[in-house]
């Protein structure tokens, strides 16, 4: 319960707070748990204790281990443990999961990404931000105090964001980086009873005998990502796969997202070498989700040959 996981990169500053809290007037002693050796308080040391804070300036891989802090008051002692892991810097851009701080979610209305642990450090602006290792540029990104604000958040803004800042200790500067994932939630997302955009109800589609014909069933199901939604064609109330006519097949078309944000699906019915008997069938475009089902019926009619005589 009173143990805290902390991590950092070699040659960067790392400051760890004792998991046990106390008044500023209480003294805090720090020990390296494996050896029970006291951590010095003199600032000339690379690793030193400063009240509730344990400072690695800079950190080294060999510093990894469990550190004990004891908060001493006139009436009681409280013990906490800091499990510190220092990792070697990665040569590539990829930030491994064990270096990631907690994921934050944002939306169109709220897109703040706070720089993790920055409140422990003596830092001055500017705070630099990177997404998937690329420096953020453009007016949509604003580094504001200890957080990043993204204007007009889109789904594509999801990813791993790294903040980089300088910690100053007695005139010496140390670099610090911290990374967290950002996910985008669509606050306006909703699902609704399916709406079929095409074909129109009871539409008559003209086809030419012997030619190929395509019918598109297009329906919308709501705004944002839609789950458990489907569009399909039926022939005389039977699924295409069960109807048993190899000339007639359906395939998923494009799934569209219109400017109003509606999520829509297409199913294209392909009829090869249209025959007379195809004109007798009833073609049903079905759109269904857990709100219900909507059906539009189409019939085929023979296209009259155009008279080209002058």
């Amino acid at each position: 319960k009173f143990s805290k996981q902390s991590w950092g990169l070699e040659n960067e500053a790392l400051i760890v707070r004792c998991p046990r809290q106390g008044k500023p007037s209480y003294t805090v002693d720090w020990y390296y748990s494996q050896t029970n050796k006291s951590i010095p308080t003199q600032e000339r040391n690379r690793v030193f204790a400063s009240g509730q804070l344990l400072k690695f300036l800079p950190a080294a891989v060999a510093d990894s281990g469990i550190y004990t802090c004891i908060v001493r008051s006139p009436t009681f002692n409280r013990t906490g443990y800091a499990n510190v892991t220092i990792y070697k810097k990665q040569s590539d851009c990829n930030v491994p999961d064990y270096l990631m701080y907690s994921t934050v979610s944002g939306s169109e209305k709220n897109s703040k990404i706070y720089c993790p642990t920055i409140d422990l450090y003596n830092w001055t602006a500017p705070l630099e931000w990177f997404k998937n290792c690329q420096a953020l540029q453009g007016s949509r990104y604003r580094a504001h105090k200890s957080f990043l604000v993204i204007d007009n958040v889109m789904t594509e803004d999801a990813g791993d964001y790294t903040c980089k800042f300088i910690h100053n200790e007695n005139g010496a500067n140390y670099s610090v980086t911290a990374t967290r994932s950002f996910t985008v939630k669509d606050e306006q997302g909703f699902s609704l009873f399916p709406v079929i955009g095409a074909p129109a109800q009871n539409e008559i589609k003209e086809v030419e005998i012997g030619k190929n014909a395509n019918l598109t069933c297009s329906a919308c199901f709501g705004k944002g990502t839609q789950f458990l939604a489907a569009v399909l064609w039926q022939l005389n109330g039977t699924k295409i796969t069960d109807f048993g006519e190899p000339r007639i097949q359906q395939e998923e078309g494009q799934n569209q997202s219109f400017s109003n944000g509606l999520a829509c699906l297409d199913m294209v019915l392909r009829i090869a070498d249209v025959k007379e008997e195809d004109l007798l069938l009833q073609y049903d475009c079905l759109a269904l989700n857990l709100h219900g089902l909507r059906r539009h019926t189409v019939r085929l009619s023979r296209k009259n040959p155009i008279d080209h005589h002058s």
């Epitope: 458990l228 939604a229 699924k239 069960d242 395939e251 699906l265 079905l286 989700n289």
Partner: nanobody, 120 residues
Framework: EVQLVESGGGLVQPGGSLRLSCAAS????????MGWFRQAPGKEREPVAS????????AYADSVKGRFTISADNSKNTAYLQMNSLKPEDTAVYYC?????????????WGQGTLVTVSS
């Protein structure tokens, strides 16, 4: 009318991978979409991914995009969820669900769930 059985859950370290399976039996010809949902302790059930039989346009929750992949083997009436780069916040009971239609109103069927724990 449809029974769903999930498998493949377990304990995995952060950054690890798991593959969940959902086997459907019964009137499977009336299944028009299959999906995965999850419920973390103390939270509401949330959608993760879903897929239609054609499989060309799977749908994913933003939180799993790029890490999870849903697929289906129609011949085996089975849906899969390949989960990579798992994070502690992916810890939840994962449920398989179907969109079922037999001529009446569409309904959803659910499995019993499989527990996924991401922890070091």
């Amino acid at each position: 009318e449809v029974q769903l059985v999930e498998s493949g859950g377990g304990l995995v370290q952060p950054g690890g991978s798991l593959r969940l399976s959902c086997a459907a039996s019964g009137r499977t010809s009336n299944i028009y979409a299959m999906g995965w949902f999850r419920q973390a302790p103390g939270k509401e059930r949330e959608p993760v991914a879903s897929i239609t039989p054609g499989g060309r346009f799977p749908a994913y929750a933003d939180s799993v995009k790029g890490r999870f992949t849903i697929s289906a083997d129609n011949s085996k009436n089975t849906a899969y969820l390949q989960m990579n780069s798992l994070k502690p916040e992916d810890t939840a009971v994962y449920y398989c669900s179907t969109l079922y239609y037999s001529g009446l109103d569409p309904v959803d069927y659910w499995g019993q769930g499989t527990l996924v724990t991401v922890s070091s």
